[in-house]
Interface confidence: low
Amino acid sequence: ELCDDDPPEIPHATFKAMAYKEGTMLNCECKRGFRRIKSGSLYMLCTGNSSHSSWDNQCQCTSSATRNTTKQVTPQPEEQKERKTTEMQSPMQPVDQASLPGHCREPPPWENEATERIYHFVVGQMVYYQCVQGYRALHRGPAESVCKMTHGKTRWTQPQLICTGEMETSQFPGEEKPQASPEGRPESETSCLVTTTDFQIQTEMAATMETSIFTTEYQ
């Protein structure tokens, strides 16, 4: 069951998922000048059995002009290992969620993918909040939100996070502070349905998110 609306907006905060529940869809979007190959997958789908989850389908982009430069990247073990270091551990999350049954890791990038990753979350998905750069967590209960089904309707639980002040960036629990931050993160923009997340992947992954559908920018 897809979540009908977006996770709650917290002023001066962004969110991200650390792993994706089975049933989550990721649109196969290509950057400008490229498009999905004809008959290519429209989306990747997190599927699996009781012991293993993975993304079904593979996104492939080809040049809009030549239409014959189809390439696809399958991550090498080293790349996969490197990506694993960007997943954050949390006191509120004793188990690495990405290794939990029924969850998929962040899919590796594919060649010429769009700067925006659009995810479609399902009931049971958890997202984690952090204060944007220049703000710190003044009060923290659980800084997370879960998409739940109640009386036949989906809703997101309210995270207990207040971000305040012009101080050092609050990181996700257990996440090291990046060596250098490019520029201040903008506040989340409200979008009725799609919300996006802007990831700048440096040594660590600093996150900027907006709502229930997610964007990732690879530099």
Epitope: D4, D5, N27, E29, C192, L193, S212, I213
Partner: nanobody
């Protein structure tokens, strides 16, 4: 589900132009193909134009091809139909509709493929 509300209709002289807008609410809008249909007095509902969720594909009825342009703004949750060189036979109530199936690669021209509909906006072309 996607809630839809059309606007932009009105009375226009033959040869004139109109831009119809369809405002959508509901976060699934981004992933659904969208279409415009019309119903003239005493006639069946007729397909006008459709656009895919990712704006890759557009489809037009022969009756409006070359005179109309469908577009969408996913950020603003809007679908548009720009109609030029209007003719009296374009007089109808115009409806915006959302495809049943998200992320569909096929842009449908049949009304049965759409399950969310707006209330419609009246377009009257005088000769």
């Amino acid at each position: 589900q996607v809630q839809l509300q059309e606007s932009g209709g009105g009375l226009v002289q033959a040869g004139g132009s109109l831009r119809l807008s369809c405002a959508a609410s509901g976060r699934t809008f981004r992933t659904h193909n969208m279409g415009w249909f019309r119903r003239a007095p005493g006639k069946e509902r007729e397909f006008v134009a459709a656009i895919s969720w990712n704006i890759d594909n557009k489809l037009y009825a022969d009756s409006v091809k070359g005179r109309s342009t469908i577009s969408r703004d996913n950020g603003g949750n809007m679908v548009f139909l720009q109609m030029n060189s209007l003719k009296p036979e374009d007089t109808a109530v115009y409806y915006c509709a959302a495809d049943k199936i998200p992320l569909s690669s096929d842009v449908a021209a049949t009304a049965t493929e759409y399950d969310d509909w707006g209330q419609g906006t009246q377009v009257t072309v005088s000769s």
